[in-house]
Structure formats: C-alpha cells, structure tokens
Interface confidence: medium
C-alpha cells in the first residue's frame, strides 16, 4: 500500500444503507467535480470509521423533516488520522459527510496547516445522492509527495452559515536526511581550535551525524543532529564532511577544505614600468597569499654599485595595487630591487631581485664659486666657476647656461649664453654701461638644466673708470654681492 497508516484501520462500510463501501464498487456517482485542474486521483482513499467519537465542528440543523423528526448533527466521518509515507510516493486521502438533501450548494474546501488550498491541487469532490441524504466524498491526492507536503490537512464545509470542520489528517513524508546546515570551508591558523557545524533533519528522526576527516571518521559514535565538531587545531590542510543517517539511509554533505594559514609566497614578475632620474615605478605579481589576505608589501632597494656600502632602503606600501614608485633615488645609478609582502602570519621571502637604472637628470646643484669681473680693456665681463660635484651632476655634463641680466635706469634685459662643458670660464660682452650686471650659472646635462647659482652682481661704470676688483659668489649667509667701484 502507498500509505503507511500507523494506526490500525479496519475497512468499515463507508456509509450505512445504500452508499458504496468503497470507490471500487459499481456505484457511479451522479456528479464528480474536480476541485481544480483535474489531476487523476492516484490511489485509494482511507477507510472511514463511523461511530467513533468526533472532535471536529458539528452543525446541528434546525430544519425537520415532513414527519417533524429532528435531523442528526452534521459531522465529517472519521478517517485515518496519520499517514506516514516515503518521499516521492503517492498518497490519497479523503473526507466524507452525509448531508440532508434539503441543503443546496454544499462545497467542501481543503486546508493545510490553517491555509486554504487553492489552485492546482489534486482535489476531487464526489456526490452520491439518495432519497433523503447525499453522501459527499472529498478526495485529495498527491502523486509524488515532497517534504513540503508534510502537515495537517482538514476539510471544511459551510451549511447555514455554520462551518463544519473535519478531524485533521497528518501527513508525514519520510526520506533520507536533508541538510539544513553543512560545514563551510575555512582558513584557520595552525593549531588553533575551530568549530564545524552540521545539521540534518528527517523525518524520520532521529538523524545521527558522523564526522569525516580526510576520508576517515573522526567519531565512530554518532551524535544526534545538530552536531558541532570542535577541531582542536590542524597542522595541515584537511577535508571535512559529515554523514547524516536515519532509518531511511544516509546523506553525505559536501566536503569542505580547511586550509592552514601560512606566510605568503614571494611576489613574482617584478618589472620596471618607468624610470626617471630620481624614481623608478615598479609592478609585481603577488605570490600565493597563504590563505590569508595580504596586508602590505615592502620594497627593498640597494645600490648595485659594488663600491657602495651595501645599505638597503626599505619602502613600505599597501598590498594593492601591486605598483609602487620608488623615489629619492640617485640619477644615472644602478639598483637591485626586491619585493616582499605580508599577511597576518608573516612576511614572504623576497622576490627574485631585478636590476634597474635611473636615467640622467638635470644637475641637482649649481656650479660653485662663481666670480665675475670686468675686463675694461676688452669691454668684456669675465666669469669663472667650479663645476658641481660629480655625484650631484646627475648625468654627463654637456655644458653650462649663463644668465646675465643688465639693469640701468629702469631698463632691464636678460640674455642667455650656452657654453661647452670644457673649462670653467666664460667671457661676455658688456651690453650696457653705467649699469648693473647680474650673473647666474647652471650646469646642463642631457637630462636638463640644473638650478642656477646664486646671483653675482657687478656694476659696469661709464667709460674711463679704472682698476676693477672681481665680484664673486658670497659665502653662505652673506647678502647678494655688489661691487661698488
């Protein structure tokens, strides 16, 4: 049988007198009304048992027959109260009631767990009229039960504004355990306890849980669901799953990987994106994160010059966006660059070192000891200087730029001279007499023009003056030099 009725139910005659004892008899109902979309009833209905006490609602009709005999109270006949069956099986159950023919338009509705069942349910109402009463059988069938069909089903009928309610029929759908909570993958710190949770439900209950670690059971003794497994810490990756067992069989959860957090792998593919005289833009591909998010990275820079003191510059940066501009570098210099990143566990090893070079830059300092003096015999201004220190030239000197500004009685004009890198002196023609000449000099490389020296001023008198002392760059802290003749 499809239904597993856990209470004994003998096949009492369904109705007294002429009513059919079962749907298998030759009585043909006068009317068969599908409740909705006409699914075929799959199975037999459960037997009813008249004469048993009834707890459903009862309607007492006030109308009497021609002989003035009071009608008996109206109530649904008893049927099986509890049906237990396996998932995907079919089931059919019914409510039946005998209604005096004086009542018209009686309809039966099905309710599950307090809500009316509307729409495409497999519900059929059949009417068996007789001289005085009509037997009404309301059948409800489900062709392939699911867990969601579990619940308490009742019939309701309205007569004279009275509601007649049947006893409930409890449907219990049994099957393999169904997981409501499965273990989840985690990244855990080595040797640190953590919990895994597994919960499964029937029916049938109870559901017992077995834990499996790397294909071996952790517990040979099952725990009732729900189960929380406290793992006392791992030293290596493990796969956990749980088995849920009930009387119908077992269901195995998904296997989840528990990873052990570790230091990251070193970054790879460190590459140079751009170089300037004093900075290098690098990028890298992060290594494996060790199952713990990267926090930050460290860029290590050391001079590749074998004569350097080997000191390492360290620049810290955020882990994203795997890009960093290293600044404050010397121009035209070679560097070894490595990258290391960290997570909560610790620092990775340093990436493979790469070589990078800065380009030529404009000199970072001006020529030193600039002196200016007037050579009246040739009507020239002689300029002398010392070239900047090699380290601060930031490239190969290609020459110098001389700025000389002539100021006289409200007139001012600036002239620029370019001179070659050889030597450290220049001569410029006097442009204006009775004027002040202000001279500044900058060193020039292919990388650009460096800063100009502090201005040196010399007064150029009218013709006929003699004996001129030179004007020179002042010592630090002195005011601009002005040679007054």
């Amino acid at each position: 049988a499809i239904t597993e009725a856990r209470e004994e139910a003998k096949p009492y005659p369904l109705f007294p007198g002429p009513f059919p004892g079962s749907l298998q008899t030759d009585h043909t109902p006068l009317l068969s009304l599908p409740h909705a979309s006409g699914y075929q009833p799959a199975l037999m209905f459960s037997p009813t048992q008249p004469g048993r006490p009834h707890t459903g609602n009862v309607a007492i009709p006030q109308v009497t027959s021609v002989e003035s005999k009071p009608l008996p109270p109206l109530a649904f006949k008893h049927t099986v109260g509890h049906i237990i069956l396996s998932e995907h099986k079919g089931v059919k159950f019914n409510c039946s009631i005998s209604v005096p023919n004086i009542y018209q338009d009686t309809t039966i509705s099905w309710w599950k767990d307090g809500k009316e069942l509307l729409g495409a349910h497999h519900a059929i109402t059949q009417f068996y009229p007789d001289d005085e009463v009509t037997a009404i059988i309301a059948s409800f069938s489900i062709t392939s039960v699911q867990r969601s069909d579990n619940g308490s089903y009742i019939c309701k009928m309205k007569i004279n504004n009275e509601e007649i309610v049947s006893d409930p029929i409890y449907i219990e759908v049994q099957g393999l355990p169904h997981f409501t909570k499965q273990p989840e993958s985690m990244n855990v710190t080595r040797n640190t306890a953590f919990n895994l949770t597994c919960q499964a439900v029937g029916p049938p209950e109870p559901v017992n849980i077995f834990w499996v670690q790397n294909s071996s059971r952790v517990n040979e003794q099952p725990e009732k669901s729900p189960s929380v497994l406290t793992v006392p810490g791992l030293t290596e990756m493990a796969v956990f799953s749980c088995e849920a067992h009930n009387d119908k069989g077992l269901t195995v959860s998904k296997g989840v990987q528990i990873n052990i957090k570790a230091i990251p792998s070193p970054p790879t593919e460190v590459s140079i994106r751009n170089s300037t005289a004093h900075s290098i833009l690098i990028s890298w591909v992060p290594g494996f994160d060790g199952y713990s998010p990267f926090r930050n990275c460290s860029i290590q820079v050391k001079e590749a010059d074998p004569l350097s003191n080997g000191s390492v510059m360290i620049f810290n940066t955020s882990a994203l966006p795997h890009l960093y501009q290293i600044k404050q570098l010397q121009a035209l210099a070679n560097y070894s660059i490595g990258v290391s990143c960290m997570n909560e566990i610790g620092w990775s090893a340093v990436s493979p070192w790469i070589l990078a070079s800065t380009t030529e830059g404009a000199p970072s300092v001006a020529p030193l000891n600039v002196t200016v003096f007037l050579n009246e015999s040739s009507d020239n201004v002689d300029i002398r200087w010392m070239k900047p220190p090699t380290k601060q030239q930031d490239g190969e000197l290609v020459g110098y730029r001389i700025s000389h500004v002539w100021q006289s009685a409200g007139i001012s004009k600036e002239l620029l001279e370019e001179v070659g890198q050889n030597g450290s002196r220049a001569r410029i023609s006097v442009q204006v007499h009775n004027a002040t000449c202000t001279v500044r000099i900058a060193a020039v490389t292919r990388g650009g023009v460096g800063p100009f020296s502090d201005p040196v001023k010399i007064f150029i008198p009218a013709h006929g003056w003699v004996d001129y002392a030179p004007s020179s760059t002042p010592a630090p802290g002195n005011a601009d030099p002005v040679l007054i003749i």
């Epitope: 071996s216 517990n219 040979e220 003794q221 099952p222 006392p232 030293t235």
Partner: antibody, heavy 118, light 106 residues
C-alpha cells in the same frame, strides 16, 4: 559491559602466518573503529593501523604495510589481524583497541603474545 | 610522522610527592591522550584529549599542555600509581605513542 577478548598466545616459526582475533561485546561493533597496537619486549607501544568496522576499509601505518592485514567478521563482532611471513622481530604482544573520537583508545583487549622463534 | 618524546624515562618518587612527566612532540598536535600500563596487563585509558580523566582515574591525576608540550601531573603520588605512562597523539596519521615514563615509588 564492554569487553574485547583476544585469542590466546601463539608460538610460530619464521616464515609462518599467524591470525589473531579480537571479539567485541557490550556495544554495537560497527559503530567504532578498531585499532591494533603492539609492544615488543622492552619497547614502547606502537600503532599498526586501524580498520573501519562500518566500511571494512583498513588503514596501515607505514611500517606495517605489506605483511600485515586487518579483517572483520561483523556477524560475530570480531576483528582479526593476520601477519604473513613472520620474522623474529614480530615477537610482541598485540593489542586490539576500540577507537573513539580523535583516536582515543577507550577499551583494550587483554593482548596476545606472539613469539616467533626457530 | 610526529614523534613523541617522554621525559624522564624513569621517575622515582616518594608517596605524597607531586610529580610531573612530560611529553614533547616534534610538531604541534591537537589532542594528547595518556595511558597507564602495569606489568602483565593491557594499557588502561587514563587521560583523554589532554585534560579529561578517564572513568575511574583518581582526581589526583591531571593533564595539561598545548602545541608541542604536554604533561601529566600527580598531585600526591600513591603506591598504586607505580606503572609506565604512555602519551599518544591524534592530530595526524599515524597515531603515535611516546616511549613511556616509568614511575617508581620509593
């Protein structure tokens, strides 16, 4: 009460085979794994491996792969250990032990002394 | 595999003394179990999962530890405690035992 009763002592020659049994009672045999442990004279305890009494799958420690075999007869709640090609160094007392959560050996057999001697 | 080293190998104590024996693992383990073995009998389960006393074990015994270092302590030694005590780990296969600490009562 829970008991693990092992078969009696065995005297064997090198190259022979011995089979030790361990009969469990007082609990559901297939609900707990069964481990095998031995102790050579003057030495400590050493774990040979275990058998899953639910599935019948054995697991062997590295030192005991090959000549050692675990088996079950669940109909009589018995686990067995068979050692082939016995060697002198197999002389030891062999214990079966019921394995609870986290390999806790909660119940032990009384031990079976296997002596291998020419 | 994880190797367990027990120390001392032999421990001599007078009744009433407090004694501690240690079990060190070559790498960190999750749980440490302890067993008592007397000559002529099988090992008895003694302390489960680091610190839980097995049924019938006197309360003067206690277990503690974490990581790679575990210990079994007897607060007041009695004559019946004379035995060899073995530690055993479950954190990775194979299950391994320590070499044992033999407790002698003076």
């Amino acid at each position: 009460q829970i008991q693990l009763v092992q078969s009696g002592p065995e005297l064997k020659k090198p190259g022979e085979t011995v089979k030790i049994s361990c009969k469990a009672s007082g609990y559901t045999f297939t609900s707990y794994g069964m481990s095998w442990v031995h102790q050579a004279p003057g030495k400590g305890l050493k774990w040979l491996g275990w058998i899953n009494t639910y599935s019948g799958v054995p697991t062997y420690a590295d030192d005991f792969r090959g000549r050692f075999a675990f088996s079950l007869d669940t109909s009589v709640s018995t686990a067995s250990l068979e050692i082939n090609n016995l060697q002198n160094e197999d002389t030891a007392t062999y214990f079966c032990a019921r394995e609870d959560n986290w390999a806790w050996f909660a119940y032990w057999g009384q031990g079976t002394l296997v002596t291998v001697s020419t | 595999q994880i190797v367990l080293s027990q120390s001392p190998a032999i421990l001599s104590a007078s009744p009433g003394e407090k004694v501690t024996m240690t079990c060190r693992a070559t790498s960190s383990v999750g749980y440490m179990h302890w067993y008592q073995r007397k000559p002529g009998s099988s090992p008895k389960p003694w302390i489960y999962a680091t610190s839980n006393l097995a049924s019938g074990v006197p309360a003067r015994f206690s277990g503690s530890g974490s990581g790679t270092s575990y210990s079994l302590t007897i607060s007041r030694v009695e004559a019946e405690d004379a035995a060899t005590y073995y530690c055993q780990q479950w954190s990775s296969n194979p299950r391994t035992f320590g070499g044992g600490t033999k407790l002698e009562i003076k």
